[in-house]
């Protein structure tokens, strides 16, 4: 049984300074661990690249809203 206490923590130390088109984004996850120096969002792009972004920025919040809405729409 793995020890959760020793589980690795992903942190973001730098944020992208470029706005990413929502068409390029597939998903996101939040970094809220107190072990990290910054609260962050990690976007995963449609080509599986992970990008750290600042959750205080409006384009980041709007992108999260867009991706959230997609989760309630059945994929066909």
């Amino acid at each position: 049984q793995p020890d959760a206490i020793n589980a690795p923590v992903t942190c973001c130390y730098n944020f992208t300074n470029r706005k990413i088109s929502v068409q390029r984004l597939a998903s996101y996850r939040r970094i809220t661990s107190s072990k990290c120096p910054k609260e962050a969002v990690i976007f995963k792009t449609i080509v599986a690249k992970e990008i750290c972004a600042d959750p205080k920025q409006k384009w980041v919040q709007d992108s999260m809203d867009h991706l959230d809405k997609q989760t309630q729409t059945p994929k066909t």
Epitope: V41, Q61, D62, M64, L67, Q72
Partner: nanobody, 123 residues
Amino acid sequence: EVQLVKSGGGLVQAGGSLRLSCAASGRTFSSYRMGWFRQAPEKEREFVALISRSGGTTFYSNSVKGRFTISRDNAKNTVYLQMNSLEPEDTAVYYCAAGAQMGWAEASTYDYWGQGTQVTVSS
């Protein structure tokens, strides 16, 4: 982490109104999707309403649609639930929650929860 402090519950007669508010502190409020959930005695916790970070999108459960209104004031770090035309079936403990993870109305995508406030609707 986010702390959520609730106010506005109480006892009201059927047909009456109540307004719940939930003030957040600790993190960037505008970066969280906010939701309200409720749990009636002997029942599971159920989704009530949510509002997007921008406030531009709201979503309601069928049981409260047209009677409840969710809103937020990002300048005041506060989310509200205006409850009108209350029915005895609305009696429950109401929780506000901050959604950090990608999702919609699923409780599992809400990371931070308020303590809950009792709403009792008498017939």
